[in-house]
Interface confidence: medium
């Protein structure tokens, strides 16, 4: 049998949440049972369609309702003919979408006006992806390039951070991360150091 | 026209084997899937397992993997339900369909438009 | 295993619209089917990929599907409409079939 991928371009780039059919052509050989694999791994995938060109021509399609990035991969597919296992030129399927966080701000509980840092990182594709930093509703930081470090020089009260994640296909929004602050003991060295009533606020550096 | 012909009623004791089976005629058996259905008494639908067109793909649904065997004959055109050892909850009615519909995107295999008339099993001691 | 999950019974008046849903958690990335069974009568194929409607169905029966709800709606029910309903997808791995629990459509 002599199978090869029918139209398809080696490389397909799809929008998340975006229906794509992969395509497959078997030509010199009658009613295949063609299977897909995705990394090496056979596809069970009931819902496949195909069309029969001609009596020894088929084309064989694998289709995804809404592709995700789990679905990113190199696909081909195969049929048996006379107990060996045909193999079609490879499809790399790249899954386009907003950015995806890999870390995201974490809660902490941190001294008054203590320093700390705050961590933030996504990817695409597509890429490049920044990073915006926010303070509650007020944007303190960026665009970077992601990863970024946030430093904070120290906060007075409980205060929420998050991040936002850009690239050319949108934003994404992480999660809040609270900053409790911790409670000092009355007798401490930090209770004499920090006078309660001035705010030790002040704008943070922003740091890739 | 497409015909799906299915093999008479059959009345089993608990522990015997049983094999129903579906004739097709009126199409090319191997340009499509055969599905298998089963409708227990005043109850709903379940999917049982479909067969690839050459036989060499077969899939089941959780609750009949192991318990039953599809297989098909293309010299025939007809394909089998088989139980190695019936149980009374086996009663019911078995639909067989020919899994696969022509559509203006192409054949759909999970297109279930042509259905047998059934047959009835039933498994009592 | 995968369930689809239906509400066992919707009642209209004739000319009403109908709606029946259907929900599963693989259903975003999984197209839905629907069956329509008659009393004593073998199911016939109503909706397929989600939307699209089948042979012979009349205009009346729509279908749609967002997020994990797919629904079956029938516009202007007709008492000729009464039957059972099902729903019908591929499990999350795409390895097997799953017919939902049936809806009874009465048409009063």
């Known amino acids: 049998a002599g199978l090869k991928l029918m139209g398809a371009p080696v490389k397909l780039t799809v929008s998340q949440g975006q229906p794509v059919k992969l395509n497959c052509s078997v030509e010199g050989m009658e009613e295949p049972d063609i299977q897909w694999v995705k990394d090496g791994a056979v596809v069970q995938n009931l819902d496949q369609l195909y069309i029969p060109v001609s009596e020894q021509h088929w084309i064989g399609f694998l289709s995804l309702k809404s592709v995700e990035r789990s679905d990113a991969g190199r696909y081909w597919c195969q049929v048996e003919d006379g107990g060996e296992t045909e193999i079609s030129q490879p499809v790399w399927l790249t899954v386009e979408g907003v950015p995806f966080f890999t870390v995201e701000p974490k809660d902490l509980a941190v001294p008054p006006n203590a320093p700390f840092q705050l961590s933030c990182e996504a990817v695409g594709p597509p890429e490049p992806v920044t990073i915006v930093w926010w303070r509650g509703t007020t944007k303190i930081g960026g665009p970077a390039p992601s990863p970024s470090v946030l430093n904070v020089t120290g906060v007075t009260q409980s205060t929420m951070f998050s991040c936002e994640a850009h690239n050319l296909k949108g934003l994404a929004s992480s999660r809040t991360a609270t900053v409790h602050l911790q409670l000092v003991p009355r007798g401490s060295s930090a209770h004499h150091h920090h006078h309660h009533h001035h705010s030790a606020w002040s704008h943070p550096q922003f740091e890739k | 026209e497409v015909q799906l012909v299915q093999s008479g009623a059959d009345v089993k004791k608990p522990g015997a084997s049983l094999t129903i089976s579906c004739q097709a005629s009126?199409?090319?058996?191997?340009?499509?899937?055969i599905s298998w259905v089963r409708q227990k008494p005043g109850k709903g639908l379940e999917w049982m397992g479909r067969?690839?067109?050459?036989?060499?793909?077969?899939y089941y649904g959780p609750s009949f993997q192991g318990h039953v065997t599809i297989s098909a004959d293309r010299s025939t055109a007809t394909a089998y339900l088989q139980w190695r050892s019936l149980e009374a909850s086996d009663t019911a009615m078995y639909y067989c369909?020919?899994?696969?519909?022509?559509?203006?995107?192409?054949?759909?295999?999970?297109?279930?438009?042509?259905w047998g008339p059934g047959t009835l099993v039933t498994v009592s001691s | 295993s995968y369930e689809l999950t239906q509400p066992p019974s919707v009642s209209v008046s004739p000319g009403q619209t109908a709606r029946i849903t259907c929900s599963g958690d693989?259903?975003?990335?999984?197209?839905a089917y629907w069956y329509q069974q008659k009393s004593g009568q073998a199911p016939v194929l109503v909706i397929y990929?989600?939307?699209k409607r089948a042979s012979g169905i009349p205009e009346r029966f729509s279908g749609s599907s967002s997020g994990t709800m797919a629904t079956l709606t029938i516009s202007g029910a007709q008492v000729e409409d009464e039957a059972d309903y099902y729903c019908?997808?591929?499990?999350?791995?795409?390895?097997?079939?799953?017919f939902g629990g049936g809806t009874k459509l009465t048409v009063l």
């Open positions: 369909v020919r899994a696969g519909g022509q559509t203006s995107g192409g054949t759909i295999p999970e297109y279930y438009q042509h």
């Open positions: 009126g199409y090319t058996f191997t340009d499509y899937w």
């Open positions: 067969i690839s067109r050459h036989g060499s793909q077969t």
């Open positions: 693989a259903l975003p990335k999984k197209y």
């Open positions: 990929e989600d939307h």
């Open positions: 019908y997808s591929i499990s999350p791995a795409g390895n097997y079939g799953v």
